[in-house]
Interface confidence: low
């Protein structure tokens, strides 16, 4: 009797199991009862990464540069390519199919952590008594300067986007 | 200003090979994309080849593929297309030119072939 | 490979008067982001060709505001509102979506 089912690495076609094409193959012929399944290697742009009956290999992805994407790993007759963003630009998502600039961090925020060719900038709130007065995608919150250290008394609060203003104390007047 | 003057082109019998080159000033060549561009007497402009800034990735023609290579020195601004087992047909003017790339609308965006040399005739005849 | 067609091919035109010129793709060039990745180049007589709009409908740098580039997907036209004299020459409409970039045959615009 034809079987039904296959064993792991076999598929079933005309009633009967054939050997399915190794990663990096694609299939030329299904086998028969007297001849091997046949299988041809992927040119040097395409890849199959699975034991597989496909007549085509798929294409490596093309990093674009237009995209502002970059290899990251070049793909095999196994593997993909790999894409990733270049520098001061990340994905717009996990398929990296675009990029987009590192967000800045607006004045009263700073960098939490810093932005890579994956993940986008994460921003902070400056706390009390640290601040930020620039957009930048990788300065942190600063501390406000102390006054006392360099015998002056603050003149000016310090916010979270700007710093204290340090004085002299005050003189006697004549 | 932004310039890209290119040369190497001649009278070249066919079978045999040329170099042309690209020369590049006043902007930062190591950032752009280039790409190789011709054109034959009375026709429309063919694209040729394109390498990417850091040479990484190349792309030829399918007209060209296997007889020319594109290639770049961003050390000395130049960029390169070595072109072996000419043609007749290969006969053209040759342009160098540059990808431009910009932010646009908060993207990281393609905006145009915006730089083109004033072009390298190659002629191929016997 | 994307076909680009062009037409007319041949675009008399009296100074003063519009002109327009379409680009038709063999496959779709608006990309996922939204954006048609489509330029349109002018090759004035004797000289290098160079950008007018990139994008389908952003004018390059420099580029007077008559030219005017429009459409999405596969159909698209450049526009010049009033020609000018130094307007005449070879305009040709690129592909920027995929390698190999293509053309289109070219279009001759002369004055009338």
């Known amino acids: 009797e034809p079987p039904t089912a296959c064993r792991e690495k076999q598929y079933l076609i005309n009633s009967q199991c054939c050997s399915l094409c190794q990663p990096g193959q694609k299939l030329v012929s299904d086998c028969t009862e007297f001849t091997e399944t046949e299988c041809l290697p992927c040119s040097e742009s395409e890849f199959l990464d699975t034991w597989n009956r496909e007549t085509r290999c798929h294409q490596h992805k093309y990093c674009d540069p237009n995209l502002g994407l970059q290899v990251q790993q070049k793909g095999t007759s196994e593997t993909d390519t790999i894409c990733t963003c270049e520098e001061g630009l990340h994905c717009t998502s996990e398929s990296c199919e675009s990029c987009v600039p590192h967000r800045s961090c607006l004045p009263g925020f700073g960098v939490k952590q810093i932005a890579t060719g994956v993940s986008d900038t994460i921003c902070e709130p400056c706390p009390v008594g640290f601040f930020s007065n620039v957009s930048s995608a990788f300065e942190k919150c600063r501390p406000w300067t102390s006054c006392e250290t360099k015998d002056l008394v603050v003149q000016q609060a310090g916010t979270n986007k700007t710093d204290v203003v340090c004085g002299p104390q005050d003189r006697q007047r004549a | 200003q932004v310039q890209l003057v290119e040369s190497g082109g001649g009278v070249v019998q066919p079978g045999r090979s040329l170099r042309l080159s690209c020369a590049a000033s006043?902007?930062?060549?190591?950032?752009?994309?280039m790409h190789w561009v011709r054109q034959a007497p009375g026709k429309g402009l063919e694209w040729v080849a394109v390498?990417?800034?850091?040479?990484?990735?190349?792309y030829h023609a399918d007209s060209v593929k296997g007889r020319f290579t594109i290639s770049r020195d961003n050390s000395k601004n130049a960029l390169y297309l070595q072109m072996n087992s000419l043609r007749v047909e290969d006969t053209a003017v040759y342009y160098c030119?540059?990808?431009?790339?910009?932010?646009?609308?908060?993207?990281?965006?393609?905006?145009?072939?915006?730089?083109w040399g004033q072009g390298t005739t190659v002629t191929v005849s016997s | 490979d994307i076909v680009l067609t062009q037409s007319p091919l041949s675009l008399p035109v009296t100074p003063g008067e519009p002109a327009s010129i379409s680009c038709r793709s063999s496959?779709?060039?608006?990309?996922?982001?939204?954006?048609?990745?489509l330029d349109w180049y002018l090759q004035k007589p004797g000289q290098s060709p160079q950008l007018l709009i990139y994008?389908?409908?952003n004018r390059a740098s420099g580029v007077p505001d008559r030219f005017s580039g429009s459409g999405s997907g596969t159909d698209f036209t450049l526009k010049i509102s009033r020609l000018e004299a130094e307007d005449v020459g070879v305009y040709y409409c690129?592909?920027?979506?995929?390698?190999?970039?293509?053309f289109g045959q070219g279009t001759k615009v002369e004055i009338k």
């Open positions: 030119v540059r990808r431009g790339h910009q932010l646009v609308l908060g993207y990281y965006y393609y905006n145009g072939l915006d730089v």
């Open positions: 006043g902007f930062t060549f190591s950032s752009y994309g």
């Open positions: 390498i990417s800034k850091d040479g990484g990735n190349k």
């Open positions: 496959q779709s060039l608006l990309y996922s982001n939204g954006y048609n990745f």
């Open positions: 994008l389908g409908s």
């Open positions: 690129m592909q920027a979506l995929q390698t190999p970039r293509t």
